[in-house]
Amino acid sequence: APVRSLNCTLRDSQQKSLVMSGPYELKALHLQGQDMEQQVVFSMSFVQGEESNDKIPVALGLKEKNLYLSCVLKDDKPTLQLESVDPKNYPKKKMEKRFVFNKIEINNKLEFESAQFPNWYISTSQAENMPVFLGGTKGGQDITDFTMQFVSS
C-alpha cells in the first residue's frame, strides 16, 4: 500500500542547517540569506515499524537523490551514513530496519531515534561545520532536537 511522504528541511535546536559535505556525509552549520539554498531537502516517508506510543517510523531520503540516511555498525559502533539505493525500489513501505527512524515529536521539536539501534539518535555537535552523526546520549552536549520546515515547491 502506498504511504504518505513530504518534502522538508531540518534544523537543529541551535538553528544550524544541514548541508552536504562530500557525496556521503551531512554537516551542520548556521546559514543565512541565499546560503539557505544549500541546505539539504529531505523526502520524509512514513514506513512500517515497531509499535510504540508517540514514536512514528519514518525514512529520510534526500529529495531527488537515490540516497537515504541509514544506521550501520562500523568498528562496532552504531554509525549514521548516507546510503545509495536503487530508485526503482525506493521508497517503499517496508524499508529495511537500518533506514528506519522513530520520529518523536513533542512541542514542535523532533527527535529521530534509530530503529536498528534503540536510544541512538541523529545528532549534531555544538561546534560549527561538524558532521551529522548517530549519538548514544540525549540531553548532553550533543544536540538531538530538530525542527522541521516544509519546503514550498
Partner: antibody
Framework: EVQLVESGGGNVQPGGSLRLSCTAS????????MAWVRQAPGKGLEWVGI???????YYASWAKGRFTISRDNSKNTVYLQMNSLRAEDTATYYC?????????????WGQGTLVTVSS | EIVMTQSPSTLSASVGDRVTITCQAS??????LSWYQQKPGKAPKLLIY???TLASGVPSRFSGSGSGTEFTLTISSLQPDDFATYYC??????????FGQGTKLTV
C-alpha cells in the same frame, strides 16, 4: 488561544465551485499538516484529504480531481477548492491539524462551515 | 481502500454502566487506530490514539485496546457527559484514511 476557524461555506448550485478557508490563530500553520473532513447532515465523518508541503497532498479517492487543498503560509491559512459540486457534497466541512506528522489522527479541529449544494 | 466497521450502530445505556464499542478494519492496521467523541453541532474530539493512548485531557474512564483488525473502546463507568456519538478511524501515514460509521450512545 490555539484555534482553527473555517469560512467560505454557503449555498451553491450543482456544478458550481466554492473555496473554503481555514485560518489558524495561536500557532503557525506553516509546519503543520492540515486535513479536511466533512460530515453530511445526520451522517458520519468522511475524510477529504491532507496537505503537508504544497507538493505533498493526499486525497480520498472520491475527492481526486474535483477537490484541491492548498496553503498560504503568509496568511496562516489552508484552503479547500471544490469544483463540479453535487447535491451529495452538502455537508459541514471541518479543517483539522494532524497531531504529529504522519500520526494520521487529529487533535485540533475547527468549528466547521456548512456547504449546501442545491438548485 | 480500508473500510472501518463499527458495532453497534446505536447503544442504550445508563449512567454508571460499563460500555464497549468495537471497530473492525478491513485489513491490518497494526495499532494505527484512533477514537473520537462527537456531540451534536460540535466538532469531533480526539479521545484515543495508537489504539490505547489517551489523548490530552481525556478522563481515565476511557480506554482503548486491540491491534491488527479488531479494536475496542471501553467506558468503564458512564457519566452524563459521555452520551454522544463515537467514531473509530484508521490512522498512521497510509494514503487512505477512513472513519467508522459511528456509534450513537443514548440514555
Amino acid at each position: 488561544e490555539v484555534q482553527l476557524v473555517e469560512s467560505g461555506g454557503g449555498n451553491v448550485q450543482p456544478g458550481g465551485s466554492l473555496r473554503l478557508s481555514c485560518t489558524a490563530s495561536g500557532f503557525s500553520l506553516s509546519n503543520s499538516a492540515m486535513a479536511w473532513v466533512r460530515q453530511a447532515p445526520g451522517k458520519g465523518l468522511e475524510w477529504v484529504g491532507i496537505i503537508y508541503d504544497s507538493a505533498s497532498t493526499y486525497y480520498a479517492s472520491w475527492a481526486k480531481g474535483r477537490f484541491t487543498i492548498s496553503r498560504d503560509n503568509s496568511k496562516n491559512t489552508v484552503y479547500l477548492q471544490m469544483n463540479s459540486l453535487r447535491a451529495e457534497d452538502t455537508a459541514t466541512y471541518y479543517c483539522a491539524r494532524e497531531r504529529a506528522i504522519f500520526s494520521g489522527d487529529f487533535a485540533l479541529w475547527g468549528q466547521g462551515t456548512l456547504v449546501t449544494v442545491s438548485s | 481502500e480500508i473500510v472501518m466497521t463499527q458495532s453497534p450502530s446505536t447503544l442504550s445505556a445508563s449512567v454508571g454502566d460499563r460500555v464497549t464499542i468495537t471497530c473492525q478494519a478491513s485489513q491490518s492496521i497494526s495499532s494505527w487506530l484512533s477514537w473520537y467523541q462527537q456531540k451534536p453541532g460540535k466538532a469531533p474530539k480526539l479521545l484515543i490514539y495508537k489504539a490505547s493512548t489517551l489523548a490530552s485531557g481525556v478522563p481515565s474512564r476511557f480506554s482503548g485496546s486491540g491491534s491488527g483488525t479488531e479494536f475496542t473502546l471501553t467506558i468503564s463507568s458512564l457519566q452524563p457527559d459521555d452520551f454522544a456519538t463515537y467514531y473509530c478511524q484508521n490512522a498512521g501515514g497510509g494514503v487512505s484514511i477512513a472513519f467508522g460509521q459511528g456509534t450513537k450512545l443514548t440514555v
